[in-house]
Structure formats: C-alpha cells, structure tokens
C-alpha cells in the first residue's frame, strides 16, 4: 500500500491521543534505552510503510503484535485516513487469523514495540530540529 | 548485535580499480542511509560518498566524483563501492557506517563498520 | 564549500573539564555530531544534534552549540577519554557531509 495520499495531521493526532498511550503501557517497566534502534524512516509514507510492517508482520519470535490493542487502533487509524487502505488489508487479516499463537510478551515483542514508539516518534516529528 | 563488515581492501596499482563492499546485519538495513568514510594514514576523517535508504540519490565528495560508484543491494543487506581510476591520494581505510535520514536531511552516523585498508601504490 | 575549524589539541588534567571546539559559520543553525576515534579503532557516535547523547555513551560527555560554535564537553576527564574527537554536519546546501580536521584530546 502506498501512503503517500493519508492524512498525516489526523493520523498524528489519534497516536497522540490513543495509540501512543496503549503503546507505552505494553511497554510498562522497561526503558526505551533497553533496546538499540534497529529499524528507521525517512519520511511520513515511510514511516508508516515500516510501523504498518512491524505491527501487522508476524516474525518467528513475535506473532501476536497484530492482536494488541494498540494495533487494533493502528489499523483503524490507517484506515480511517487513508484512502483504500482497508481494501488492501481484507486478504492479509484473514491470513493472519490462520496463524494465531498463543498470546506471550516476550523480550523480543518488547524489542519490536520499543521500535515501533520510535518510528511513530520520527512519524509525528516532521521536521529535524534544524535544517 | 548491529554490525557492519567492511571487505574488498588490498594493494592496487594507480588507475586500476578495486570493489569494496559492505554487509550489515543486526538491523533493518533498508531503512537507513548509508555512508562511506575514509581515513589516510595519520590524517582525519573524510567522506566519501552517500546513498539514500532506498538508494534513489546518492551524493559524492568532489574528490571522488566521476571516479567512485556507491550503490546498495536491500535485498541482500550489502553496500558497495566501486573505485575506478584510483590514484595514490586514495590510500586510506574506508568505513562504511549508517545514518537514520529524514526526507533530504542525512542525520548522525550511529554504527561503523572496523574499515577496510585500500592502498594504491605503483 | 562549508569548513568546520577544531584545534588540533586540548589537553586536560585528570578529573578536569575539557572542552573542545568546532568552529562553522552559523554553525548554530546546524546539527553538530561528535565521534571519538581511538588508535586503530573506527569512530564512535558520543554526541548528535547538538547536545544528544546515545544511551551507551557516559553522561560526562555533554554538548552546546551556538553563534559560530559547537562544543564537546567532557567532564571528569579521565585517561580512557583519550583519543581523537571529529565534529560533523550535513550540508543541506550542497547535499555534502563535512567533518572537522580533529582534535587530539590528551590527559596528562
């Protein structure tokens, strides 16, 4: 899916408002410095090309993102404002209903939840503090 | 563990050419910028070259420009550097290194590689 | 094209304060990065845009960056801080990054 045309300012607003919330609470009791960035974006479709990615992805040693309430919001805000978004996930949602696992928080979710808060972190700053 | 390995050094005659390349790993490789710096025997630190996350753009230092070739292969984690019309002033170490970028902007190098010795001698 | 001005030593005595400079014209209205070198080592990342600090790097390592100047400050100098240190901008005029010459940080 092609980001390019979502609406960045409202999609901004419901991280700040919501997601950013369920995010930092799945995170609870461990710092953001635990955990070296490891993935990055360059741009607002990037960015949300790559959280798209690590949150609806199943990795062999964290299948269960997708199930989480922050992403449950992710998918309704990209949904929300982005034109024809949610025709492009129909496929991968019932996919991923075949390959339900059991629901652990191991570190390495914990991992790729601490790179999600920073791509949504470079997501919501638009601009380098100087240019 | 993040890492990047620089290979492909060695000795090189004058005006020959040489490949060094570059293998990342430990991170999502496609999602960063990626540099080449070099460092002559005793000198400072001096880049080289730049491409772009998805290696779109590249940019050069005039002392290399029309002479070396940065590309990437996302698909297989590697950076690379082709070096043609080498001359003794490019007897250096070369590191490659990574940059998170925003749009244009290239930001700090977080990760280098251990470097890769190029000497061009006759 | 854009230069960077560091002196080529600092010296400090053990415990003590150095403060190395990096000298640009409105250098302030750049992000300034800061790299440690030791002998036969590749740089080390110690300070980006300005004045933020990786989290494996020691909070003795602070930076400043105003007017003409950026600054590395080191506090509590101690012998394993020797080693060469590099600012380093991005261009955005002419798409270049720029490092500075280096400075030679010895603790005496």
């Known amino acids: 899916y092609d980001f390019t045309n979502c609406d960045f300012q409202k999609i901004e607003a419901d991280y700040l408002r919501t997601i950013s919330k369920d995010l930092i609470t799945y995170m609870s009791g461990t710092k953001s410095t635990d955990f070296n960035n490891t993935v990055s974006c360059s741009n607002r479709p990037h960015c949300l090309t790559e959280i798209q990615s690590l949150t609806f992805n199943p990795t062999p040693r964290c299948a269960s993102l997708a199930k989480e309430m922050f992403a449950r919001k992710t998918k309704a805000t990209l949904a929300l404002w982005c034109p024809g978004y949610s025709e492009t996930q129909i496929n991968a949602t019932q996919a991923m209903k075949k390959r339900r696992k059991r629901k652990v928080t191991t570190n390495k979710c914990l991992e790729q939840v601490s790179q999600l808060l920073g791509l949504w972190r470079r997501f919501i700053r638009t601009l380098l503090k100087k240019q | 563990q993040m890492q990047l390995v620089e290979s492909g050094g060695g000795v090189v005659q004058p005006g020959r050419s040489l490949r060094l390349s570059c293998a990342a790993s430990g991170f999502t490789f496609r999602t960063y910028g990626m540099h080449w710096v070099r460092q002559a025997p005793g000198k400072g630190l001096e880049w080289v070259a730049v491409?772009?996350?998805?290696?779109?753009?590249?940019h050069y230092a005039d002392s290399v420009k029309g002479r070396f070739t940065i590309t990437r292969d996302n698909s297989k984690n590697t950076l690379n550097l082709q070096m043609n019309s080498l001359r003794a002033e490019d007897t250096a170490v070369y590191y490659c290194?990574?940059?998170?970028?925003?749009?244009?902007?290239?930001?700090?190098?977080?990760?280098w590689g251990q470097g890769t010795m190029v000497t061009v001698s006759s | 094209s854009y230069v960077l001005t560091q002196p080529p030593s600092v010296s400090v005595a053990p415990g003590q304060t150095a403060r190395i400079t990096c000298g640009g014209n409105?250098?302030?209205?750049?992000?300034v990065h800061w790299y440690q070198q030791k002998p036969g080592q590749a740089p080390v990342l110690v300070v980006y845009?300005?004045?933020d600090r990786p989290s494996w790097i020691p909070e003795r390592f602070s930076g400043s960056n105003s007017g003409n100047t950026a600054t590395l400050t080191i506090s509590r100098g101690e012998a394993g801080d020797e080693a060469d240190y590099y600012c380093?901008?991005?261009?955005?005029?002419?798409?270049?990054?720029?490092f500075g010459g280096g400075t030679k940080l010895t603790v005496l």
């Open positions: 409105n250098i302030g209205s750049k992000s």
């Open positions: 380093q901008i991005w261009d955005s005029s002419s798409s270049l990054v720029v």
């Open positions: 491409v772009w996350y998805d290696g779109s753009y590249t």
């Open positions: 845009d300005d004045s």
């Open positions: 290194a990574r940059s998170p970028q925003w749009e244009e902007i290239f930001e700090a190098m977080d990760i």
